[in-house]
């Protein structure tokens, strides 16, 4: 089931998967002077079993002017380039796909791509949030925002961050511990696929994780 | 290119069996998912089911759930669904596409006695 | 399963017009959607995908527009050559559906 909205958004922050749940879909769209080719796909999907998950399809991109070139990035597990855009920071390896069943890590850049990803995300799926550079974080619980399923309806929960502009960069996912209150994080709704195992594994990861590549819009 | 073709149509039986293939050229085969719908005569469309590109990720429609098998052979670039126990109301036109774009001719399958 | 309502299920209309076909789905889908084009006796054509981005290839006649559950596909000034089923079919979600179709006839 796909969220029917974007995650939440917080003044002065940015949100990142740090893995995506099976079924969550990746736009092929490609930079200004460039499109699609009729070869290439038109989304990547996150597939897989109990063991193992990928992304299918290949995204690739072409210029506009000329037809006959196609320039194209096969999705390489091992492969992590630089993506080169303003808003980005610094690129992770991601850890390893295996480390989180039923998930994808994030798909590597293909040539040409446009500037911001747009991912569709599933129920279940985690962000998590990190203060824009000069701004300082606040918890008041977990960085973070889960897409869940109540009453027939997809929302995001509400991540309990505050960044306040202190000249100061904190270190993703937050310098300070996340302080897991009652208050924190309303759950007295009933939530689907998300399961205590999904929270821990990738709240470990999380913390283990160097800054991540940041896009700013998700669809 | 991409280029879809499909065979394996034909008359058969209710009750009988039946499989399609689906060639596939133009494009890296072995990275994308596939699926098969299909179209009776002067009907709409029905998505009938899909396969990830490792085949680790398999869907169905409920109409064919536990008759059709869909699986594909990377290597040798071919999709292919296994059709059995057959009835009337699969008679229909079958094509192989992928991410909707890019469609096979098509291959009939015509369920009778 | 996401049900998609597609209209008119047909339409008689004259070279040069302009005509528009709507596709409803019963949830959101988030522009996920592929508008197609059956020629008789003929395959498929994907026309527009991701709700509005024209296919390479396909003339600017042809566009699409739309949101969370209501999508169309609009062709303007018609041509010979546009005489055709239309589908539309959502890939947001498992198991894909399509629309009925429209038939599109000459006046």
């Known amino acids: 089931e796909l969220c029917d909205d974007d995650p939440p958004e917080i003044p002065h922050a940015t949100f990142k998967a740090m893995a995506y749940k099976e079924g969550t879909m990746l736009n092929c769209e490609c930079k200004r002077g460039f499109r699609r080719i009729k070869s290439g796909s038109l989304y990547m999907l996150c597939t897989g079993n109990s063991s193992h998950s990928s992304w299918d399809n290949q995204c690739q991109c072409t210029s506009s002017a000329t037809r006959n070139t196609t320039k194209q990035v096969t999705p390489q597990p091992e492969e992590q380039k630089e993506r080169k855009t303003t808003e980005m920071q610094s690129p992770m390896q991601p850890v390893d796909q295996a480390s989180l069943p039923g998930h994808c890590r994030e798909p590597p850049p293909w040539e040409n791509e446009a500037t911001e990803r747009i991912y569709h995300f599933v129920v279940g799926q985690m962000v998590y949030y990190q203060c824009v550079q000069g701004y300082r974080a606040l918890h008041r619980g977990p960085a973070e925002s889960v897409c869940k399923m109540t009453h027939g309806k997809t929302r995001w929960t509400q991540p309990q961050l505050i960044c306040t502009g202190e000249m100061e960069t904190s270190q993703f996912p937050g310098e300070e511990k996340p302080q897991a209150s009652p208050e924190g994080r309303p759950e007295s709704e009933t939530s689907c696929l998300v399961t205590t195992t999904d929270f821990q594994i990738q709240t470990e990861m999380a913390a283990t994780m160097e800054t991540s590549i940041f896009t700013t819009e998700y669809q | 290119d991409v280029q879809l073709v499909e065979s394996g149509g034909g008359l058969v039986q209710p009750g009988g069996s039946r499989k399609l293939s689906c060639v596939a050229s133009g494009f890296t085969f072995s990275t994308f998912g596939m699926h098969w719908v299909r179209q009776a005569p002067e009907k709409g469309l029905e998505w009938v089911a899909y396969i990830s590109s490792g085949s680790g990720t398999i869907y169905y429609a409920d109409t064919v759930k536990g008759r059709f098998t869909i699986s594909r052979d990377n290597p040798k670039n071919t999709l292919f669904l296994q059709m059995t126990s057959l009835r009337s109301e699969d008679t229909a036109m079958y094509y192989c596409?992928?991410?909707?774009?890019?469609w096979g001719q098509g291959t009939l399958v015509t369920v009778s006695a | 399963d996401i049900l998609m309502t597609q209209s008119p299920s047909s339409m008689s209309v004259s070279l040069g017009d302009t005509v528009s076909i709507t596709c409803h789905a019963s949830q959101g889908i988030r522009s996920n959607i592929v508008w197609l084009q059956q020629k008789p006796g003929k395959s498929f054509r994907g026309l527009i995908y991701h709700g509005t981005k024209l296919e390479d290839g396909v003339p600017s006649r042809f566009s699409g527009s739309g949101s969370g559950a209501d999508y169309s596909l609009t062709i303007s000034s018609l041509e010979s050559e546009d005489f055709a089923d239309y589908y539309c079919v959502q890939y947001a979600q498992f198991p894909r559906t399509f629309g009925g179709g429209t038939k599109l006839e000459i006046k």
């Open positions: 596409a992928r991410d909707w774009m890019n």
